[in-house]
């Protein structure tokens, strides 16, 4: 009983339950392959509990191992379109600080119009995650088709 | 030591560890696009710890943020079949209560025969999740090819 | 405050936070469809906290329900290649002890060059997970394209 009470009284953030689920806000201007994200209850079912958005990119606030997941669906896309515009590629990586820059997750669309994946990776406070979509097809902004999130798993 | 003991003595449900992994039971009759699920150790590796099944649909018992994941494989399917029967689409959503009805996750098969994805989403006690498969191709009931699950992540 | 301190003082393993993320080491010789994995901070962003590697296969050290996830990308692959060499199939399963041998997760590549999925499954101490890739195409060893991991979720 004492433990259950303690668990409820402590702020969730102190338990390391950082979590975020984002929806697509917009794509970048030409020459900027980054996707720009947004989150918050006013926008629907997206949220940020711990991590923050910095100019549409996700910044981590707590060191730890995270489950990173993403789904991106291309708008106005058929398998024919996808193969004609191939290769369209999505990469999720740490883009800042520059010293920690690395690609964490990469997928190509080939003849499909949706990619979805997830992975465990260590992230540090201050790491900013960028999602780069290269190719000529636009992503859908439907919140059930395109989303990006992280979940703190352990220190 | 005291904490570890307390953790073991408390029922897991009080820790908020609601989790479920389901296998396909059957598809609906014509005009009903829903997939009907089943779970329990007698059936193999599926289980329900917290959530419940209501006429083959998954009902949530604890408020919180959940990781929802799904994989559906179409039976008797090749890339040729898939493209010929296109579009086949899977949508996971809250279907009741009606006031909270919303699509959470949507994917099309295009030229593939399997879709798999996952996302974080807030769910409330009483939310029922439905998985709608629209199209003319039948899903496989093999337990390693088609499954659907949720995992409570945080309040 | 006392709980937070207790949480920090206890070894993480006693909290049941077993987790691993592996990168591809090599494929097996002919007639051996298994992928051989490696992990550890010296190798990049892969790690093992709890589970161990046994001749390139992942061995579980703690009973519980796990989230198992995998992404495999085929090297030197286009949708044309993938369909010509089709079907290439990936299966994740318990391969030892033999008495518990079972396929947990299975996907075909069809006309794509990447598969990614995840599922919840009960695993027991001593279970060894094998990932079998059948077909004539080789997997990429890029750490952002091919990876395999598990995360303990609850007892």
């Amino acid at each position: 009983q004492r433990f259950a009470q303690a668990q409820q009284q402590l702020p969730l953030e102190s338990l390391g339950w950082d979590v975020a689920e984002l929806q697509l806000n917009h794509t970048g201007p030409q020459q900027d392959p980054r996707l720009y994200w947004q989150g918050g209850p006013a926008l629907g079912r997206s949220f940020l509990h711990g991590p923050e958005l910095d100019k549409g990119q996700l910044r981590i606030h707590r060191d730890g191992i995270y489950m990173v997941h993403i789904q991106v669906t291309l708008a106005i896309c058929s398998s024919t379109t996808a193969s004609r515009h191939h290769p369209t590629t999505l990469a999720v990586g740490i883009c800042s600080p520059a010293s920690r820059s690395i690609s964490l997750l990469r997928l190509s669309f080939h003849q499909g119009c949706t990619i979805a994946s997830q992975r465990l990776t260590p992230l540090a406070r201050g790491d900013t995650l960028c999602t780069n979509l290269t190719g000529t097809l636009l992503p859908s902004r439907n919140t059930d088709e395109t989303f990006f999130g992280v979940q703190w798993v352990r220190p | 030591q005291r904490f570890a003991q307390a953790q073991q003595q408390l029922p897991l449900e009080s820790l908020g560890w609601d989790v479920a992994e389901l296998q396909l039971n059957h598809t609906g009759p014509q005009q009903d696009p829903r997939l009907y699920w089943q779970g329990g150790p007698a059936l193999g590796r599926s289980f329900l710890h917290g959530p419940e099944l209501d006429k083959g649909q998954l009902r949530i018992h604890r408020d919180g943020i959940y990781m929802v994941h799904i994989q559906v494989t179409l039976a008797i399917c090749s890339s040729t079949t898939a493209s010929r029967h296109h579009p086949t689409t899977l949508a996971v959503g809250i279907c009741s209560p009606a006031s909270r009805s919303i699509s959470l996750l949507r994917l099309s098969f295009h030229q593939g025969c399997t879709i798999a994805s996952q996302r974080l989403t807030p769910l409330a006690r009483g939310d029922t999740l439905c998985t709608n498969l629209t199209g003319t191709l039948l899903p496989s009931r093999n337990t390693d090819e088609t499954f659907f699950g949720v995992q409570w992540v945080r309040p | 405050q006392r709980f937070a301190q207790a949480q920090q003082q206890l070894p993480l393993e006693s909290l049941g936070w077993d987790v691993a993320e592996l990168q591809l080491n090599h494929t097996g010789p002919q007639q051996d469809p298994r992928l051989y994995w490696q992990g550890g901070p010296a190798l990049g962003r892969s790690f093992l906290h709890g589970p161990e590697l046994d001749k390139g296969q992942l061995r579980i050290h703690r009973d519980g329900i796990y989230m198992v996830h995998i992404q495999v990308t085929l090297a030197i692959c286009s949708s044309t290649t993938a369909s010509r060499h089709h079907p290439t199939t990936l299966a994740v399963g318990i391969c030892s002890p033999a008495s518990r041998s079972i396929s947990l997760l299975r996907l075909s590549f069809h006309q794509g060059c990447t598969i990614a999925s995840q599922r919840l499954t009960p695993l027991a101490r001593g279970d060894t997970l094998c990932t079998n890739l059948t077909g004539t195409l080789l997997p990429s060893r890029n750490t952002d394209e091919t990876f395999f991991g598990v995360q303990w979720v609850r007892p």
């Epitope: - | 059957h26 009759p29 008797i76 003319t136 899903p139 496989s140 | 060499h85």
Partner: antibody
Framework: EVQLVESGGGLVKPGGSLRLSCAAS????????MNWVRQAPGKCLEWVSY????????YYAESVKGRFTISRDNAKNSLYLQMNSLRAEDAAVYYC?????????????WGQGTLVTVSS | DIQMTQSPSSLSASVGDRVTITCRAS??????LAWYQQKPGKVPKLLIY???TLQSGVPSRFSGSGSGTDFTLTISSLQAEDVAVYYC?????????FGCGTKVEIK
């Protein structure tokens, strides 16, 4: 014991119709996909049609599409094949067969078959 | 459509012989292949599914192997009661298709 018993075969003129039935017993009929497979005398086996356990998914061989209709009545544990615009090449023994539980279509039980003859 | 080609179309072997029948698919079908036995005047009987899984009640002298496009049915020690026509069938995609059979006889 699983049993599948076909009926309804017979002699019919080209352009005519027949309705085949298959009565199932010994298993939970509503849990399994069902199929019709035919075999002309001295010829290979040919798959004709597939229906899912709930009846929501139906597939046909190209040679019968638009002429044959598969259906089932789970309350009566029965499978049907309505055959219209019959042709000489439709003459065969028609087998009712059970698909496997996973919804894939290999056939683990077969009926004894019913003979359809199409001749003027 | 996926064509299934069986060879040989017929064979004759002695009791106790090891018999091998092959089935080739016109395109890859993974392991979605079944083998059936049809004895004279009888209905087909499922022997093997998923290319290599023995159906319950089938004698262990029957085995299947292969993946992709090339498959084999082996009878390790032919018995008099194995005289039959053997068919392969793919269930990878519709239309479902059968091979035209291999007739096995005793010398």
């Amino acid at each position: 014991e699983v049993q599948l018993v076909e009926s309804g075969g017979g002699l019919v003129k080209p352009g005519g119709s027949l309705r085949l039935s298959c009565a199932a017993s010994g298993f939970t009929f509503s849990s399994y996909s069902m199929n019709w497979v035919r075999q002309a005398p001295g010829k290979c086996l040919e798959w004709v049609s597939y229906i899912s356990s709930s009846g929501g998914y139906i597939y046909y061989a190209e040679s019968v599409k638009g002429r044959f209709t598969i259906s089932r009545d789970n309350a009566k544990n029965s499978l049907y094949l309505q055959m219209n615009s019959l042709r000489a090449e439709d003459a065969a023994v028609y087998y009712c067969s059970r698909g496997d539980y996973s919804n894939y279509a290999y056939f683990d039980y077969w009926g004894q078959g019913t003979l359809v003859t199409v001749s003027s | 459509d996926i064509q299934m080609t069986q060879s040989p179309s017929s064979l004759s072997a002695s009791v106790g012989d090891r018999v091998t029948i092959t089935c080739r698919a016109s395109q890859g079908i993974s392991n979605y292949l079944a083998w059936y036995q049809q004895k004279p005047g009888k209905v087909p009987k499922l022997l093997i599914y998923a290319a290599s899984t023995l159906q319950s009640g089938v004698p262990s002298r029957f085995s299947g192997s292969g993946s992709g496009t090339d498959f084999t049915l082996t009878i390790s020690s032919l018995q008099a009661e194995d005289v039959a026509v053997y068919y392969c069938q793919q269930y990878y995609s519709t239309p479902l298709t059968f091979g035209c059979g291999t007739k096995v006889e005793i010398k």
